[in-house]
């Protein structure tokens, strides 16, 4: 699996999507699960609905949402007020049973928000064509990891 | 209407190898899990393994890991179970199966195909 | 694997009467995905129970499913010719998708 990187500004909601097969999961509870090291467990981080029949209903476990569109197959998760805390590496799953498949490996990073003055070296300033007008805008970038990137800080 | 039909019953020394065929008809071939089944000469149901045709992802059973390979072609709505080097004991019936859906979910196996018979003896 | 057990392994009944056949999960069967099947002799498998239980498209109501968790229960409330024959259960949560060893029905 590549990894996709979603960036999202400090104190902002950040909404990460999962694309997938909606036929092949059908009848499928998905989880967004928080990757603990490179090589380590992926820890639930929250699931949709136990029943499937309602994974439209977006489930909250503290600041992270989970929502499922089964028939377009698109799973939804939003990390509402961004702290620095948050970036790291996670993954959309689709569960069977005491298995789970994954949908899509994420890197969330986290911007500093350019209107924060409280830490002026971390400012990073949006490109011409996105607006901060709307404090309240979800707002994300995702990009794919190119070949040979690491998604985690090397350990010495 | 939905259907499954498989390749006829075969007659093989031990050491052969052999492709058995179970072809879809009546629904979208490739949005729908495909699995086989074997049943022994008066035995139940063993699972197999299934595979996914619209992108061939394949779960085995791990008691036939390695003795069996389920591949599909998208092309002829087909499924194929084969064997390298057959046995003595994969002498059974072998049933291939398609996974239902519900509104509120999986639902199950339906239809199934009548079965191929292999026979394997020297 | 989840492993299935089936019981009783044969039950002997006769036209009329309601028969009771159990199958337990060494574990949780989550989302209560477990069917029921029925085989007779030379015939292949045909679904009856599907979600532990939904009737499948075109089975009688005389057949029906119960339970949740690790029991569950496959109900035929009175006993027709037609009906003597192989049941098996089967998860399908957790690949591999195990079936139970089965219970014969057969006439008293």
């Known amino acids: 699996h590549n990894t996709t990187v979603f960036q999202g500004v400090a104190g902002q909601s950040l909404q990460v999507s999962c694309p997938y097969d909606s036929m092949k999961h059908w009848g499928r509870r998905k989880a967004w699960c928080r990757q603990l090291g490179e090589k380590g467990p992926c820890q639930r981080v929250v699931s949709t609905h136990n029943l499937w029949l309602l994974s439209f209903l977006r489930r909250w476990n503290g600041s992270t949402a989970i929502t499922d569109d089964t028939l377009g197959g698109t799973l939804t998760i939003t990390l509402r007020n961004l702290q620095p805390h948050d970036a790291g590496l996670y993954q959309c799953q689709s569960l069977h049973g005491s298995e789970a498949d994954t949908l899509r490996k994420v890197l969330v990073e986290v911007l500093a928000d350019p209107l924060d003055h409280r830490d002026a070296g971390d400012l990073w300033f949006p490109g011409e064509s996105e607006s901060f007008e709307d404090a309240h805008v979800e707002h994300s970038i995702s990009r794919s990891l190119l070949e040979g990137e690491i998604p985690f800080p090397p350990t010495s | 209407e939905v259907q499954l039909v498989q390749s006829g019953a075969e007659v093989k020394k031990p050491g052969e190898s052999l492709k058995i065929s179970c072809k879809g008809s009546?629904?979208?071939?490739?949005?729908?899990?495909i699995g086989w089944v074997r049943q022994m000469p008066g035995k139940g149901l063993e699972w197999m393994g299934i595979i996914y045709p619209g992108d061939s992802d394949t779960r085995y059973s791990p008691s036939f890991q390695g003795q069996v390979t389920i591949s599909v072609d998208k092309s002829s709505s087909t499924a194929y179970l084969q064997w390298s080097s057959l046995k003595a004991s994969d002498t059974a019936i072998y049933y291939c199966t398609r996974q239902a859906i519900a509104v509120t979910g999986l639902g199950g196996f339906d239809p199934w195909g009548q079965g191929t018979l292999v026979t394997v003896s020297s | 694997e989840i492993v299935l057990t089936q019981s009783p392994g044969t039950l002997s009944l006769s036209p009329g009467e309601r028969a009771t056949l159990s199958c337990r999960a060494s574990q949780s069967v989550s989302s209560s995905y477990l069917a029921w099947y029925q085989q007779k002799p030379g015939q292949a498998p045909r679904l009856l129970i599907y979600?532990?239980?939904s009737r499948a498209t075109g089975i009688p109501d005389r057949f029906s499913g119960s339970g949740s968790g690790t029991d569950f229960t496959l109900t035929i409330s009175r006993l027709e010719p037609e009906d003597f024959a192989l049941y098996y259960c089967?998860?399908?949560?957790?690949?591999?998708?195990?079936f139970g060893p089965g219970t014969k029905v057969d006439i008293k």
């Open positions: 009546g629904y979208t071939f490739t949005s729908y899990w």
């Open positions: 979600g532990a239980s």
């Open positions: 089967q998860q399908y949560d957790t690949s591999p998708f195990t």
